[in-house]
Amino acid sequence: PEPPTACREKQYLINSQCCSLCQPGQKLVSDCTEFTETECLPCGESEFLDTWNRETHCHQHKYCDPNLGLRVQQKGTSETDTICTCEEGWHCTSEACESCVLHRSCSPGFGVKQIATGVSDTICEPCPVGFFSNVSSAFEKCHPWTSCETKDLVVQQAGTNKTDVVCGPQDRLRA
């Protein structure tokens, strides 16, 4: 047959030759020839390549910079990149997690619907009727108003989304 114009999976075409790609974790040193195989070398410490490739340089592992609030969630290998996450109380600003910001707090009148993670911010919701939050917090949900009735008391001051009801003793009816 004549030299090929297309190659099999995990091969690439160069100089009319179908050469084997380098496996993940290795970089290309030299293309194959009529008489020799593709030559590959393992990536060095702190380097990786995560696909079958013909790259002549491995990629550097991501650096989880503590100054940006980052820490290592999963150490990189020759075939995988390092995965960063944020320190406690912080979350990533993007999917790539290149920097962190402090978790948002829910203001008074709002409660935490979903607590923040290393990759997502706090989700707040307004306290509905019958619930309140009187603090700025990244953890506190809206609390239900106190039930005066169960304490054999009456509502002296109505609750709001920021304050609890104030209960007091029932007025005695004088004869």
């Epitope: 084997s20 020839t33 008489f35 195989e37």
Partner: antibody
Framework: EVQLQESGPGLVKPSETLSLTCTVS?????????WNWIRQPPGKGLEWMGY???????NYNPSLKNRITISRDTSKNQFSLKLSSVTAADTAVYYC?????WGQGTTVTVSS | DAVMTQTPLSLSVTPGQPASISCRSS???????????LNWFLQKPGQSPQLLIY???NRFSGVPDRFSGSGSGTDFTLKISRVEAEDVGVYFC?????????FGQGTKLEIK
Amino acid sequence: EVQLQESGPGLVKPSETLSLTCTVSGYSITSNYYWNWIRQPPGKGLEWMGYIRYDGSNNYNPSLKNRITISRDTSKNQFSLKLSSVTAADTAVYYCARLDYWGQGTTVTVSS
Amino acid sequence: DAVMTQTPLSLSVTPGQPASISCRSSQSLENTNGNTFLNWFLQKPGQSPQLLIYRVSNRFSGVPDRFSGSGSGTDFTLKISRVEAEDVGVYFCLQVTHVPFTFGQGTKLEIK
């Protein structure tokens, strides 16, 4: 077009060292490929002697024991053969080759 | 070493007729990646060897399509579908899977 050209003395005395140089044009010997020396004694077949790779490392035919050295001069795009302690059995046409391209060959006679 | 045995050692063919040369290796020429580095060369009278076929079945650039190579493992064949006068010379197989590289002893093709 890749071209290879052998050069060196055509007559070497027994027990002396045979020295040949191959000048390559049209391709850098540091880019890729294995750069070989092959010989053909009169009326006989071809014998692979050894190669120097694009990265400068070598491989030799064990039949030549410790007599053979292949080196290179990258500034001149040349590679060289040295064969020590020669005898009449080393009389041959010597080729340098990339295997897809060959030099025209040079005849070396070992005689006193 | 991989010993390469060619048959026949000589061949006389009428122009236009086919010719076939066999090359057998004493060990498999398939490497761990599944590739086989078996090559065929023609050395015309007074010339250097020229590459015809590489990696068992791939024609080198400029080689007429009447030349074809086949085989696997230890058994390989070079076929000329219709011999022409210019095809005379000695045909060699060469394996470069294992070091040392080794040639077959050659098959001389003559025209009747």
